[in-house]
Interface confidence: medium
């Protein structure tokens, strides 16, 4: 806590100026008014502040507004932000994208910091959806971004904003998040032609079901391996040699070099030796002839 | 045009002090504050600190902290360095350079001194 | 204490494209402008970029800088002899105001 001193004669703070970087920290705290430091927040960032400095600078907004600061001060906070904690944050009421492009600015290039995961948490929260121009910024600060919320918040993500998601923006996400964003990738696409859907769609197929998946199989959209095996494993299993060939196209070669991975292996095991020679792979593993194939999904829901 | 011009070249005994000058001109003297920046031979940029012409008020590099007391004299458009309980290893060209406003850079600096320390 | 990092020295034959990088933290170039300075041999150093990528006027526009996160770099295309010059990266630092990279010395084949 910085000690309550009298401003020295001739030292009071007119304006925030450069000047002001030769204040000791007393001399900040009893030469700077608050009132005057809020409405030229936007200066600060120019002047060569030290950190030291910036705590007295953020004490005195922190007495001013003690129930969080105002949207016209947080938009101007630029390198003050990163003083910021958490728990000043989530005091914040955050409604324009411009604020937030602004502080999301200051932290270009870093890793996304515990700050910027409150800021982005209460924008969201008070705007009640992930829209897309939101969306949009935040993809474009954060690829990863969308793939760090649970399935529960990409619920709130409407179809119209799935258009601004890159394939790269879905690099880091796992099953369950994929199971969320497919349905609503499905239905923003919907209107499209095949083969433009399915690029769109392409990077959504790990949330597939196997129905989708025998429906691709029919339009020749030579899907390849890499998609193939980010595919849901329940999804693929029941897919047929023949619907496999078809959904891969060219691609299918490339089964050889993964039958020991997941979902290709599992999938082997699930078909007829004799269905996979056709292919001309050598795939090794799958059912000999002569065998009885029980569905045992289908028996235990029959008893 | 804006100019920033040195006093000459210093030789000084380990313990002495030693004082130079920079003449500021072609600009407001007290409009633009002036940094000091030392450089050992052979060696990269040292800031050593900063003055205010407007009201003399000045910020040192924790390094030089009471060794270094930079002044001016606003009536002649000079702004002076004084370094004292010098030592071999302060042997450097020392430049006065000017700060522009609003953004972290020099934009005009003097032609050197070269102060050197020797017994 | 030297918190900017530059490489001692780079070189390249004229007509090519050559690269200086500065490399910081969050308290300097994370969180400021970066500017570069061009030392030729025995003279004073001279403003190259400001504000992480402007060219003051009379600086050739084979000069260009950029930043991203804590690091900057400085990229020099169309190498001439008279290149050959040290080249320092500056910021201020937060935490100990003001900040010069180590300098790199650059050699034109």
């Known amino acids: 806590e910085v000690e309550k001193t009298a401003c020295p004669s001739g030292k009071k703070a007119r304006e925030i100026d450069e000047s002001l970087i030769f204040y000791k920290k007393w001399e900040l705290e009893a030469c700077v008014d608050a009132a005057l430091l809020a409405t030229q927040m936007d200066r600060v960032n120019a002047i060569p502040f030290t950190y030291e400095q910036l705590d007295v600078l953020k004490h005195k907004l922190d007495e001013l507004y003690p129930q969080g600061y105002p949207e016209s001060v947080i938009q101007h906070l630029g390198y003050l932000f990163l003083k910021m904690s958490p728990e000043d944050i989530r005091k914040w009421n955050v409604t324009s994208l411009e604020t937030l492009k602004a502080l999301l600015e200051v932290n270009k290039g870093h890793e996304m910091s515990p700050q910027v995961a409150t800021l982005i948490d209460r924008f969201v929260k008070g705007r009640g959806q992930l829209d897309k121009d939101t969306l949009d910024t935040l993809t474009a600060f954060y690829p990863g971004y969308l793939c760090s919320l649970s399935p529960e918040e990409l619920s709130s993500v409407p179809p119209s904003s799935i258009w601004a998601v890159r394939p790269q923006d879905l690099d880091t996400c796992d099953p369950r998040q994929l199971d969320v964003l497919y349905p609503k990738a499905r239905l923003a696409f919907q209107n499209m032609n095949g083969s433009e859907y399915f690029v769109k769609i392409q990077s959504f197929l790990g949330g597939a079901p196997t129905e989708d998946l025998k429906a691709l199989s029919q339009q020749n959209v030579s899907m390849d391996l890499a998609t193939f095996m980010k595919l849901r494993t329940d999804a693929v299993l029941p897919l047929t040699v023949a619907e496999v060939q078809k959904l891969l196209g060219p691609h299918v070669e490339g089964l050889k070099a993964e039958e020991r991975h997941r979902p290709v292996r599992d999938w082997i095991l699930r078909q007829r030796q004799d269905d996979l020679d056709t292919l001309g792979l050598g795939l090794q593993g799958g059912i000999p002839n002569g065998y009885l194939v029980l569905d045992l999904s289908m028996q235990e829901a029959l008893s | 045009q804006v100019e920033l011009v040195q006093s000459g070249a210093e030789v000084k005994k380990p313990g002495a002090s030693v004082k130079v000058s920079c003449k500021a001109s072609?600009?407001?003297?007290?409009?633009?504050?002036i940094n000091w920046v030392r450089q050992a031979p052979g060696q990269g940029l040292e800031w050593m600190g900063i003055i205010n012409p407007h009201g003399g008020d000045t910020k040192y590099a924790q390094k030089f902290q009471g060794r270094v007391t930079m002044t001016r004299d606003t009536s002649i458009s000079t702004a002076y360095m004084e370094l004292s309980s010098l030592r071999s290893e302060d042997t450097a060209v020392y430049y006065c350079?000017?700060?522009?406003?609003?953004?972290?850079?020099?934009?005009?600096w003097g032609q050197g001194t070269l102060v050197t320390v020797s017994s | 204490d030297i918190v900017l990092t530059q490489p001692p020295s780079v070189s390249g034959a004229p007509g090519q494209r050559v690269t200086i990088s500065c490399s910081g933290s969050s308290s300097n170039i994370g969180s400021n402008y970066v500017s570069w300075y061009q030392q030729l041999p025995g003279t004073a150093p001279k403003l190259l970029i400001y504000n992480d990528n402007q060219r003051p006027s009379g600086v050739p526009d084979r000069f260009s800088g950029s930043k991203s996160g804590t690091s900057a770099s400085l990229a020099i295309t169309g190498l001439q002899s008279e290149d050959e010059a040290d080249y320092y990266c500056s910021t201020y630092d937060r935490r100990t105001f003001s900040v010069f990279g180590g300098g790199t010395k650059l050699t034109v084949l």
């Open positions: 350079a000017r700060w522009h406003h609003g953004t972290w850079i020099f934009d005009y």
């Open positions: 072609g600009y407001t003297f007290t409009g633009n504050y």
